[in-house]
Every structure is written in structure tokens, then in C-alpha cells.
Interface confidence: medium
């Protein structure tokens, strides 16, 4: 189960001559809305075939009235996402049909009328759970810019939303052979069976039969420390004599990133970091403004101050890059203390603590106070691997066993005299002062400058500090 989401960024006349000035006919005002249809597979299906994966309709946009003399403005669009829920597995390959309709608001014989302005069809491969994919499509004289993604919902995970996780409320609920689902630590799933012999300590797998190595380990079964591997950093076909990889062409060789983009290698591919004003797999799309919605992951778009930077994306916490397209590895800062495992859930960081530690950053040692009592009514405060006692009044020391003199700090102001008492201290105030610490001056007429003395106490009486 999951949801396919489509975000329309803009719809308007395409570049070039002959582009229409207005989506409305001569009959009067209109408003736009969109319909999305999803069909499984990449085959050329009959247009009439049903939207087997689902369909959705957007809300209607604001009313648009053409101003004959004015330049064609951006067309007002409906707000929000189009969401198409799917119940079964996400097929990975699908046909996406986006229709732009206009609702004609002039007098219509037979009631309100809809007219189709544009229909674009894309046959795509898309894994669920991936980032937003962006697209620009032309249909006749119109141009449509949009983003889309598929995400799993409920307890489904994986690129097809077919792997189910069972919620749990305590670690013990993950039974034998179950492990926490990444990245959600509060769910369990059956792990895939890795390649035979794959190191349990240094290897892992996301698909059955594979063996992927943790950082610092290499080899087909992740048993070779990377520091001792003579093949580290090499790529290409394996050499029969040494068992090492012979250098081959890397995905960034020849820099596939256009317009000054910088290339970085990813497993089996590459990634371009684009300068401002460009985006796309190879930074090939240019002329972008805030109207195009170039900021991903909820980034705020602000128009640039100079022509070279048409826009600037202000990224939300956890994202970076000129288009907020890169997730910050916040775990690299090692925020989890006492050996806790860091999980970046996107919306938040979470630490999975080792046994005996707790707290948002595993900062509390649960054993600090175990079996250690604080005497004389003191309370134990754990932290940093050692316990500390917060002592009751009149007591001090590591375990609150030492009698403390509450008058040692000279708490009585204005020459008041301090007396130790079973529940703390008492100040006997000098003439002209009152209060539990003799802090309030008394006016000559017997009225205090600040709160009045409680009933039954005259100014100058000893004040018991409760």
C-alpha cells in the first residue's frame, strides 16, 4: 500500500511563436484543474484502458479572466498535491497520464462544461520511497512542469511497498530472526537472506543473495579489512592473477555534469551537484526561477538579487545543496553518546542506546543510581556514568550523610542573625527589616515596602524559613 504524489509546478504557454495567450476560450472566464491517471507497465496501452493503478482530480484553480492588452501572466493553479493511493504493490514501471482541463464559467447550454487543454503521457520507471522526480513536458503549445514520487504507507516498506513491518512497542517484540526496519526503529521486519558466508559483523544485505560491506570492510563476503586490501580504490574488471580490481573508467570520468556542476561517484553511478540556476541529472536544465519550484524537500525559494542567481533555496534542517536536494548526514556529527547507534529518520534524529543507557542522546546511565541510596531524604540524579545526590536541606556530601550548616552561606541580609533549625534555617532580622531572609526594609510607619508580613508576625519578629 502507498500513495503516488504529483505536484504541478507550472502550466502555461510553451516557448516559441504561436503559443496561446490564454487557456480560456472567447466565451469568458475559466479555471484550470488537473486529472492524473496511472496505468501499470510501460507498454503502449489503449488510451481508453482504465487507470488500473488509480486516478485523482485536483481542486479547481482560481478563476482566470484574460486581459486582452496585458501580457500573459502565469496561469493560476490549484493548490496542493494530487494523491493517488494504491492498495497493492507499486509496480515500478508505469504510465503517467496528466490531463489539464479548463472549466468554462460562461453560460453553457447543458450546464457547466469541461474542455481538455493538454494531455501528457510518460512511461516511467520509479522506485517507491525515492526522492521527487522532476519533469517538463510539452503538449501542443502548452508546457507542464511537475514533480512526482511514490511512497509507501501504513506498514509497507521497500521499493515496491511489498515488505511489511510489524509495529512493536518494546524491543522484546522483535522475535527471533527479526530486526528493526531501517530507518524506522519502532518496526520489525524479517531480514533478507544474505549471500552464504556474508560476514554477520561487517556485512549486510537489503536484497536476498547480496552482501554489502560496512565502512572499513571489503571483499565478496566483507571479511577483508579495507585498510589491508591492496585493491582499495580501484574499479573495473577483476584481475585473475591478483584477485584485485583493475582500474577502469569511473562514472565521473569526463565529468558528465554540465554548466559547471561537480560530479561525485555513487555506487554504480554518479551524482551532480549543480550551481544555482541549474538542475536535472546532469545540471542540464537552466533558466529556473522560483515559479518552477526548484527547491526540494520543503526548501524556501527566494528570488536572487543578481541575474546570475535566479533563485536561492533556503533549506530546512537536514537538507543542503543549491536545491536542498541532498540530505545532510547528521549522524556524522556522532550525536549519540555512550556508544549509541545514530538513526537519521529525516524528520528527526534518533539514538538507539546500548543496554544501560537512555535519553534522547543516550546521555543517561540507567545504572548510575542502581543500588545507591542517598541518605537523609536525598534524591539520586544519574548522569555521565556516575551518580550524584541532591540533598535535603541541612545535609551535604556525596551521599548526603554529612550534616551541613545552613547558616554557612550567611543567608540573612542586613545584619540578620541566622539560626539552624530542623527544617532549614531561621533569620532573626535586625530592627527595620523583615522577610524570610530579612530582605525587605520596613517603613518608619510600620508598613513594609514589599509584601506585608503574614498575620501573627510583627516586623522584627524572627521569620521562620519554610
Amino acid at each position: 500500500a502507498g500513495v503516488f504524489e504529483l505536484q504541478i509546478h507550472s502550466f502555461g504557454p510553451g516557448p516559441g511563436p504561436g503559443a496561446p495567450r490564454s487557456p480560456c476560450s472567447a466565451r469568458g472566464p475559466c479555471r484550470l484543474f488537473f486529472r492524473v491517471c496511472l496505468k501499470p507497465g510501460l507498454s503502449e496501452e489503449a488510451a481508453e484502458s482504465p487507470c488500473a493503478l488509480g486516478a485523482a482530480l485536483s481542486a479547481r484553480g482560481p478563476v482566470y479572466t484574460e486581459q486582452p492588452e496585458a501580457p500573459a501572466p502565469d496561469l493560476p493553479l490549484p493548490n496542493g498535491l494530487l494523491q493517488v493511493p494504491f492498495r497493492d504493490a507499486w509496480p515500478g514501471t508505469f504510465s503517467l497520464i496528466i490531463e489539464t482541463w479548463r472549466e468554462e464559467l460562461g453560460d453553457q447550454i447543458g450546464g457547466p462544461a469541461w474542455s481538455l487543454l493538454a494531455r501528457v503521457t510518460r512511461r516511467r520507471r520509479l522506485a517507491a520511497g525515492g526522492p521527487w522526480a522532476r519533469d517538463i513536458q510539452r503538449a501542443g503549445a502548452w508546457e507542464l512542469r511537475f514533480s512526482y514520487r511514490a511512497r509507501c504507507e501504513l506498514l509497507a516498506v521497500g521499493t515496491a511497498c511489498t515488505r511489511l513491518c510489524r509495529p512493536r512497542s518494546a524491543p522484546s517484540r522483535c522475535g527471533p530472526g527479526l530486526r528493526p526496519c531501517a530507518p524506522l526503529e519502532d518496526e520489525c521486519e524479517a531480514p533478507p537472506v544474505c549471500r552464504a558466508g556474508c560476514s554477520l559483523e561487517h556485512g549486510f544485505c537489503e536484497q536476498p543473495g547480496e552482501c554489502r560491506c560496512l565502512e572499513g570492510w571489503t571483499g565478496p563476503l566483507c571479511t577483508v579489512p579495507a585498510s589491508t586490501s591492496s585493491c582499495l580504490g580501484l574499479r573495473g574488471p577483476s584481475s585473475a592473477t591478483t584477485g584485485c580490481l583493475v582500474p577502469g573508467p569511473g562514472p565521473c570520468d569526463g565529468n558528465p555534469c554540465a554548466n559547471g556542476g561537480s560530479c561525485s561517484e555513487t555506487p554504480g553511478s554518479f551524482e551532480c551537484t549543480c550551481p544555482r540556476g541549474f538542475y536535472g541529472l546532469r545540471c542540464e536544465v537552466s533558466g529556473v526561477t522560483c515559479a518552477d519550484g526548484p527547491c526540494f524537500n520543503g526548501g524556501l525559494c527566494v528570488g536572487g538579487a543578481d541575474p546570475d542567481s535566479a533563485y536561492i533555496c533556503h533549506c530546512p534542517p537536514g537538507f543542503q545543496g543549491s536545491n536542498c536536494e541532498k540530505r545532510v548526514d547528521r549522524c556524522s556529527l556522532q550525536p549519540c553518546r555512550n556508544g549509541g547507534l545514530c538513526l537519521d529518520l529525516g524528520h528527526a534524529l534518533r539514538c538507539r542506546c546500548r543496554a544501560g543507557f537512555a535519553g534522547p542522546r543516550c546521555e543517561h546511565n540507567l545504572d548510575d543510581c542502581a543500588g545507591r541510596a542517598c541518605a537523609n531524604g536525598g534524591t539520586c540524579v544519574e548522569g555521565g556514568g556516575a551518580h550524584r545526590c541532591s540533598c535535603a536541606l541541612g545535609f551535604g556530601g556525596r551521599d548526603c550523610r554529612e550534616r551541613a550548616d545552613p547558616c554557612a552561606a550567611r543567608p540573612c541580609a542586613h545584619g540578620g542573625r541566622c539560626y539552624a533549625h530542623f527544617s532549614g534555617l531561621v533569620c532573626a532580622c535586625a530592627p527595620g527589616y523583615m522577610g524570610s531572609r530579612c530582605e525587605f526594609p520596613v517603613h518608619p510607619d510600620g508598613v513594609s515596602a514589599l509584601p506585608a508580613a503574614p498575620p501573627g508576625l510583627r516586623p522584627g519578629d524572627p521569620q521562620r524559613y519554610l
Partner: nanobody, 129 residues
Framework: QVHLMESGGGSVQAGGSLRLSCAAS????????MGWFRQAPGKEREGIAT????????YYADSVKGRFTISQDNAKNTVYLQMNSLKPEDTAMYYC??????????????????????WGQGTQVTVSS
């Protein structure tokens, strides 16, 4: 198998009210329109109100605007038609229908039958003066 079932019809005096219900089963209800149509003896079937459940877009025929209200309960896959200030000319068989723009259409009228592929059996409403 798609099934639409109307209920709530009956006889009422002019100026009175009725509430019709249409329950949909076996239908991907959220992706299309559900509408109410009526047909008086010897007349064409006419659309009076329609709603798109996903975005609550509604349309009404001029003859019922301000008197009839279409609403939905997504959880129950049910659409309602609240009819107030009924007139004798509202007497007809009332049908519930489901559908939307045909796949290859380039023009569609939400209050006309074409595009509505699924129909209920109808419920009779009689308004006497």
C-alpha cells in the same frame, strides 16, 4: 462488480424535505464523480447535482440551486442529496450515477449522462401540491 443502491425516496407535500442516499460498493469511489440524475415521465434524464469525492467539487443544475445539497461520507462510500423546499415539478425517478470524463474525451459535461458508466436502479420521489 460495481453496485449503486439508492434509498430515501417517497411522497411528500410541496415545501417539504427528503434526503436521498446512494451507497456505492465495488467502486473506486474516490477517483471519480458521483451524481444525482432524475427523469420525469416523458422527459429526458437530467443531471441535478454531482460531487467529486476526492476534492469535493460540486455542480448543481440551475433548477435546484439553493434548494438541494449534495454531500458525501467517504468512510461509508455514500453520497446524499438533501432536498428542501420541494415543488411538484421535482416529482421524478431519481437515479444515482458514478463516472467522470471518458478516457479519451476532450469535452465533458458534469451534469449530463455521458461519462457516467454506473447507474443505480432509482428511487421514486413524488411531491404533491
Amino acid at each position: 462488480q460495481v453496485h449503486l443502491m439508492e434509498s430515501g425516496g417517497g411522497s411528500v407535500q410541496a415545501g417539504g424535505s427528503l434526503r436521498l442516499s446512494c451507497a456505492a460498493s465495488g467502486y473506486t469511489y474516490r477517483s471519480n464523480f458521483m451524481g444525482w440524475f432524475r427523469q420525469a415521465p416523458g422527459k429526458e434524464r437530467e443531471g441535478i447535482a454531482t460531487i467529486h469525492s476526492g476534492v469535493a467539487t460540486t455542480y448543481y443544475a440551475d433548477s435546484v440551486k439553493g434548494r438541494f445539497t449534495i454531500s458525501q461520507d467517504n468512510a461509508k462510500n455514500t453520497v446524499y442529496l438533501q432536498m428542501n423546499s420541494l415543488k411538484p415539478e421535482d416529482t421524478a425517478m431519481y437515479y444515482c450515477a458514478a463516472g467522470g470524463p471518458p478516457a479519451n474525451a476532450d469535452r465533458w459535461y458534469p451534469l449530463r449522462p455521458p461519462g457516467y458508466n454506473y447507474w443505480g436502479q432509482g428511487t421514486q420521489v413524488t411531491v404533491s401540491s
